[in-house]
Interface confidence: medium
């Protein structure tokens, strides 16, 4: 409960906000959840707490884990959890689903793409913007404050947009990138019974005990903007929110991508520190629209190590 997913790339800055709301004057204590060890507030540390914010300057893959914040007001103590995953830099241009922020839709009249999480950082304009890893050039693109505006939006403008900026902390600069999909609303759309692209039905995924793993639920629903199109994970037939295990989280927001003109939605189930009992669970990817519901099941199994003599 009160757990928020945050992710970033190694060697970039990552700033995470405690998911409990309160006043800036409240005292906030941060801990490593596993060890209950307090996180220092001194800025000379690479990872330090600063009120409601937890700062990784820069982040390392080993920082991944669950962090506890306790917000102490004069009347209550409130506990929250930040589930942090730091990934290795991708060697190629492809941005995997688990690094994507929520999708935004645009039309000819409104084509603003906000840079996700930027409000947490101390940055100065201008932002750099990339589409499918190519720097955006031309008068159609205007970087304005924390968002990008595209003039005369066309269907070709759909794709993955990355903003890049510099966070400054006490004179030191750290790079930050964030990517989200942009979809263009198409008037001539239609909807179909959901088609689940991943996982395959009754698939089994091999995992290492103690490692993190991600399961992607991806389905297509038709062409163009969809009135209702949702994908979600269930555990043993129960909603993720009813399953009180902070290690297992469904990402906030759903990424919408267009594959061959089809409207497809993804959501990632993140499982931190895989345990034996996770192998006993049934993981259901549910895709729902006005036509109905489709379900694909996936199970986890322990990775077999082949010993060579």
């Amino acid at each position: 409960k009160f757990s928020k997913q945050s992710w970033g790339l190694e060697n970039e800055a990552l700033i995470v906000r405690c998911p409990r709301q309160g006043k800036s004057s409240y005292i906030v204590d941060w801990y490593y959840s596993q060890t209950n060890k307090s996180i220092p507030t001194q800025e000379r540390n690479r990872v330090f707490a600063s009120g409601q914010l937890l700062k990784f300057l820069p982040a390392e893959v080993a920082d991944s884990g669950i962090y506890t914040c306790i917000v102490r007001s004069p009347t209550f103590n409130r506990t929250g959890y930040a589930n942090v995953t730091i990934y290795k830099k991708q060697p190629d241009c492809n941005v995997p689903d688990y690094l994507m922020y929520s999708t935004v839709s645009g039309s000819e009249k409104n084509s603003k793409i906000y840079c996700p999480t930027i409000d947490l950082y101390n940055w100065t304009a201008p932002l750099e913007w990339f589409k499918n890893c190519q720097a955006l050039q031309g008068s159609r693109y205007k970087a304005h404050k924390s968002f990008l505006v595209i003039d005369n939006v066309m269907t070709d403008d759909a794709g993955d947009y990355t903003c890049k900026f510099i966070h400054n902390e006490n004179g030191a600069n750290y790079s930050v990138t964030a990517t989200r999909s942009f979809t263009v609303k198409d008037e001539q759309g239609f909807s179909l019974f959901p088609v689940i692209r991943a996982p395959a039905h009754n698939e089994t995924k091999e995992v290492e005990i103690g490692e993190n793993t991600n399961l992607t639920c991806s389905a297509c629903f038709g062409k163009g903007a969809q009135f209702l199109a949702t994908v979600q994970w269930q555990l043993n037939g129960n909603k993720i929110t009813d399953f009180s295990e902070p290690r297992i989280q469904q990402e906030e927001g759903q990424n919408q991508s267009f594959s061959n003109g089809l409207a497809c939605v993804n959501t990632v189930l993140r499982i931190a520190d895989v345990k034996e009992e996770d192998l006993l669970l049934r993981y259901d990817c549910l895709a729902l629209n006005l036509h109905g519901l489709r379900r694909h099941t996936i199970r986890l199994s322990r990775k077999h190590h082949h010993h060579h003599h």
């Epitope: 409960k1 009160f2 709301q21 309160g22 006043k23 004057s25 409240y26 917000v71 007001s73 004069p74 009347t75 209550f76 409130r78 909603k239 929110t241 009813d242």
Partner: antibody
């Protein structure tokens, strides 16, 4: 001991405006949120809104939006709730209560407002 | 807006009885549910916050449970001084009180 002392009962005519005060003692009003709650005679509790007195940020329940104004004077540790365009159904006891963003911990004694022509 | 359905609206029980009051929300909320007691002619008093955390000074016969959309306040052994109206409050999105449950002694 935290204490919240509210102003006295009021009788108002329909269409008028009422302003209730809530003075906090043994507590700095800036340190937490101040909420206001309505309770009509024989009825349940209804949250009206809250203020962060340190910065003046307010949020109001949809039902009262446009008619209620919550303010705070940090120099006197006093919060105020003003309700305009009064009608007979606004006859109620109004409570101030201090707490965090999510809930109320300490309550004032209540102020009865009677709206009658 | 989040709607709260509190039940029952009133109930009568004997001293020593186990009493449960339920609040159901129309949407999944985190455990941002709190329980208040209001004795006749008195101001409301916070009993339980965040689903199941007892406020200091509140007798241990009071407990809270539930998650998602269904929440329960339980009085394990009803005492005469528990005669009051009980309200749940959600604060997942703004704040909304339940309609209240008036508890009387048989």
């Amino acid at each position: 001991e935290v204490q919240l002392v509210q102003s006295g009962a009021e009788v108002k005519k329909p269409g008028a405006t009422v302003k209730i005060s809530c003075k906090v003692s043994a507590f700095n009003i800036k340190d937490d949120y101040m909420h206001w709650v309505q309770q009509a005679p024989g009825k349940g509790l209804e949250w009206m809104g809250r203020i962060d007195p340190a910065i003046g940020n307010t949020e109001y329940a949809e039902k009262f939006q446009g008619r209620v104004t919550i303010t705070a004077d940090t120099s006197t540790d006093t919060a105020y709730m003003e309700l305009s365009s009064l009608r007979s159904e606004d006859t109620a006891v109004y409570y101030c209560a201090t707490g965090d963003f999510y809930a109320m911990a300490y309550w004032g004694q209540g102020t009865l407002v009677t709206v009658s022509s | 807006d989040i709607q709260m359905t509190q039940s029952p609206s009133s109930l009568s029980a004997s001293v020593g009885d186990r009493v449960t009051i339920t609040c159901i929300t129309n949407t999944d909320i985190d455990d941002v549910i709190h329980w208040y007691q209001q004795k006749p002619g008195k101001v409301p008093k916070l009993l339980i916050y965040e689903g199941n955390t007892l406020r200091p000074g509140v007798p241990s016969r009071f407990s809270g449970s539930g998650s998602g959309t269904d929440f329960t306040l339980t009085i394990s052994s009803l005492q005469p001084e528990d005669v009051a109206t009980y309200y749940c409050l959600q604060s997942d999105n703004m704040l909304t009180f339940g309609q209240g449950t008036k508890l009387e002694i048989k």
